[in-house]
Amino acid sequence: MRRGPRSLRGRDAPAPTPCVPAECFDLLVRHCVACGLLRTPRPKPAGASSPAPRTALQPQE
């Protein structure tokens, strides 16, 4: 018989914990992992056809 729905905290997942500065908490694997920085480009000038897509800085390797 299949299990019922899992809670959104996953399979016995601990609550998110503080990570060191170069890391962030991955809810999927429930651990701190290496993280890059999100970067939102400055808005285009008035009259631009569409908002600039959001991008990111790559994690440090």
């Epitope: 996953g10 962030c24 991955d26 999927l28 651990h31 993280c35 999100l38 994690p59």
Partner: antibody
Framework: EVQLVESGGGLVQPGGSLRLSCAAS????????IHWVRQAPGKGLEWVAW????????DYADSVKGRFTISADTSKNTAYLQMNSLRAEDTAVYYC??????????????????WGQGTLVTVSS | DIQMTQSPSSLSASVGDRVTITCRAS??????VAWYQQKPGKAPKLLIY???FLYSGVPSRFSGSGSGTDFTLTISSLQPEDFATYYC?????????FGQGTKVEIK
């Protein structure tokens, strides 16, 4: 340059075993999570397993739990998928992939950014 | 497990068309959705992560939106190289699950 290279696929009889390897270069696997995803011929993508090599945590799809084991050797920067008790329905191209994370208010915002070329596993008598 | 339901399963479009693919999660996944493009015989490529963030190197004609249970991938002006199969994936909770795919074909 980040690269993932799978190996170890092939033809195996039902009930047999195979060990797939995923050799990583250009990054350290201990700092991220590595996933195996498979694709049966003409079908969609199915996640199989993940490992966080830096912590040793693993998880599996229900369809492979108890038969497959994911592991990693951080000294070789390589992840593995040991597949036992193989069934015809395990026939697929197996990909390994790295999950990339970006910091969004302290939580990972990410996806699988680098994938291997895939290795075909055929289970047939 | 969280089910990801994509629609349509296939569509025919012409170069220059605006194409929209939707993905519905069976429960709230916040913004933890990624979109991938796959061409025959090739590995998938990440296009969008966290529902609306464009991955590095992906053309700006691709965009994503949504949160909670409903998500959209839009190609603003379809190019010849965009004919492929597209998958959504949630990564809010293990197991990470994919949609069944949407094949974008030439009309």
């Amino acid at each position: 340059e980040v690269q993932l290279v799978e190996s170890g696929g092939g033809l195996v009889q039902p009930g047999g075993s195979l060990r797939l390897s995923c050799a990583a270069s250009g990054f350290t696997i201990s700092s991220s999570s590595i996933h195996w995803v498979r694709q049966a011929p003409g079908k969609g993508l199915e996640w199989v397993a993940w490992i966080t090599p830096g912590h040793g945590s693993t998880d599996y799809a229900d369809s492979v739990k108890g038969r497959f084991t994911i592991s990693a050797d951080t000294s070789k920067n390589t992840a593995y998928l040991q597949m036992n008790s193989l069934r015809a329905e395990d026939t697929a191209v197996y990909y390994c992939a790295r999950r990339v994370c970006y910091n969004r208010l302290g939580v990972c915002a990410g996806g699988m950014d680098y994938w291997g070329q895939g290795t075909l596993v055929t289970v047939s008598s | 497990d969280i089910q990801m339901t994509q629609s349509p399963s296939s569509l025919s479009a012409s170069v220059g068309d605006r194409v929209t693919i939707t993905c519905r999660a069976s429960q709230d996944v916040s913004t933890a959705v990624a979109w991938y493009q796959q061409k025959p015989g090739k590995a998938p490529k990440l296009l969008i992560y966290s529902a609306s963030f464009l991955y590095s190197g992906v053309p700006s004609r691709f965009s994503g939106s949504g949160s909670g249970t409903d998500f959209t991938l839009t190609i603003s002006s379809l190019q010849p190289e965009d004919f492929a199969t597209y998958y959504c994936q949630q990564s809010r909770i293990t197991p990470p699950t994919f949609g069944q795919g949407t094949k974008v074909e030439i009309k």
